[in-house]
């Protein structure tokens, strides 16, 4: 199970993981205490048939070709959490592991 | 965490799970001993912003709007395995749990 890594200088057109730093302050998300910024990454690119397909299911749907199935798209296939300190809706400070905040790998599904 | 379920008569345009029976015999996949057919389901539909987004990450990437990010697409967000009996490449009969063969839920990611 692997995925491509790219950067802003890459000429890769296929599904790839790109770097992206999310800045909560710039978004006005002032309920986030820490971190104020983190490396989130994102997925972008084309999904030629079979390239980086995560599941056999994707291949099967392509073969069955049902009405409205749009073919696979470039999407996170492995994500990881980050530890965050934030205010909840009751003015309490909460520390927690927030799942699926970082894209570790991209693929076609 | 929920997702929409549709069928061939639905008028729903948003991201939805549709029924799909995969027939291995029809595909010519003769190395599959059993099951010969199974209910795989598939995802199809539009991902309006925020609708059925599985991860906060999806929302953050939309806000950051980096070069080449295409917006979320309708993709499996929960999958389950099936038990299969099949021939491997060494002519051995294998019984095993094959992951991610059935779409249980669709969402935008």
């Amino acid at each position: 199970d692997f995925g491509l890594d790219c950067d802003e200088h890459s000429t890769e057109s296929r599904c790839c993981r790109y770097p992206l730093t999310v800045d909560f302050e710039a978004f006005g998300w002032d309920w986030i205490i820490a971190p104020k910024r983190y490396k989130a990454n994102y997925c972008s690119g084309e999904c030629e048939f079979v390239f980086l397909q995560k599941y056999p299911h994707t291949h099967l749907v392509h073969q069955a070709n049902p009405r409205g199935s749009a073919g696979p798209c470039c999407t996170p296939t492995k994500m990881s959490p980050i530890n965050m300190l934030y205010f909840n809706g009751k003015e309490q400070i909460i520390y927690g592991k927030i799942p699926a905040m970082v894209v570790d790998r991209c693929g076609c599904s | 965490d929920f997702g929409l379920d549709c069928d061939e008569h639905s008028t729903e345009s948003r991201c939805c799970r549709y029924p799909l029976t995969v027939d291995f015999e029809a595909f010519g996949w003769d190395w599959i001993i059993a099951p010969k057919r199974y209910k795989a389901n598939y995802c199809s539909g539009e991902c309006e912003f925020v609708f059925l987004q599985k991860y906060p990450h999806t929302h953050l990437v939309h806000q950051a709007n980096p070069r080449g990010s295409a917006g979320p697409c309708c993709t499996p967000t929960k999958m389950s395995p099936i038990n299969m009996l099949y021939f491997n490449g060494k002519e051995q009969i294998i019984y095993g749990k094959i992951p991610a063969m059935v779409v249980d839920r669709c969402g935008c990611s």
Epitope: D30, W31, I33, A34, K36, N83, L85, F87, E91, I93, Y95 | -
Partner: antibody, heavy 113, light 108 residues
């Protein structure tokens, strides 16, 4: 950008009063509890008082209880600290803060005859 | 009431050396709400490490935090000139905030 700007500090005689203000910008002020923290010259940080988002609940350290009053005006995005019966040991830089992350630059209060 | 005791009061070290700062609580505290600040002369404190061991944004990875229960540690693996400052631990419980007395890291 979040900014907390304190004002109202100065020289006051023992037994006197002073009112500090903290103007908040870049922050959804009405959603958060706010605090005052002080630092005597050459000393460490001391939490003084806190108030919840609506202003309905207030909290004080034992050293200032009964003498200081914290309040807020959410329509003006402003936090206040009314300080009465001031003592020499109240001399400090007073910081307005949304603990633990946002702090003002502080205003100096000197209590001396 | 929880009391946080920091030691040593002053740490005299040279650039490049390792600094180990201690923060001891009078009773067991939640590691989720034990934070460290750095303060330089004439400046407001800034959040350095949150929830015992997580680096705040923009903080270099030569800083690290650890601990649980009553004993917490801030470590600077290799001191840089800009690291000479005062460091405070802080605990949060409800609307009550407690600060340690601080450790001054000075140039030897």
């Amino acid at each position: 950008e979040v900014q907390l700007l304190e004002s109202g500090g100065g020289l006051v005689q023992p037994g006197g009063s002073l009112r500090l203000s903290c103007a908040a910008s870049g922050l959804t002020f009405s959603r958060y509890g706010m605090s005052w923290v002080r630092q005597a010259p050459g000393k460490g940080l001391e939490w003084v008082s806190a108030i919840n988002s609506s202003g309905g609940s207030t909290y004080y350290s034992d050293t200032v209880k009964g003498r200081f009053t914290i309040s807020r005006d959410n329509s003006k995005n402003t936090l206040y600290l009314q300080m009465n019966s001031l003592r020499a040991e109240d001399t400090a830089v007073y910081y307005c803060a949304r603990l633990p992350d946002y702090w003002g630059q502080g205003t100096l209060v000197t209590v001396s005859s | 009431e929880i009391v946080l005791t920091q030691s040593p009061g002053t740490l005299s070290l040279s650039p490049g050396e390792r600094a180990t700062l201690s923060c001891r609580a009078s009773q067991s505290v939640s590691s989720s709400y034990l934070h460290w600040y750095q303060q330089k002369p004439g400046q407001a404190p800034r959040l350095l490490i949150y929830s015992t061991s997580n680096l705040a944004a923009g903080i270099p990875d030569r800083f690290s935090g650890s601990g649980s229960g009553t004993d917490f540690t801030l470590t600077i693996s290799r001191l840089e000139p800009e690291d000479f400052a005062v460091y405070y631990c802080q605990h949060y419980s409800g609307y009550h905030f407690t600060f340690g007395g601080g450790t001054k890291v000075e140039i030897k």
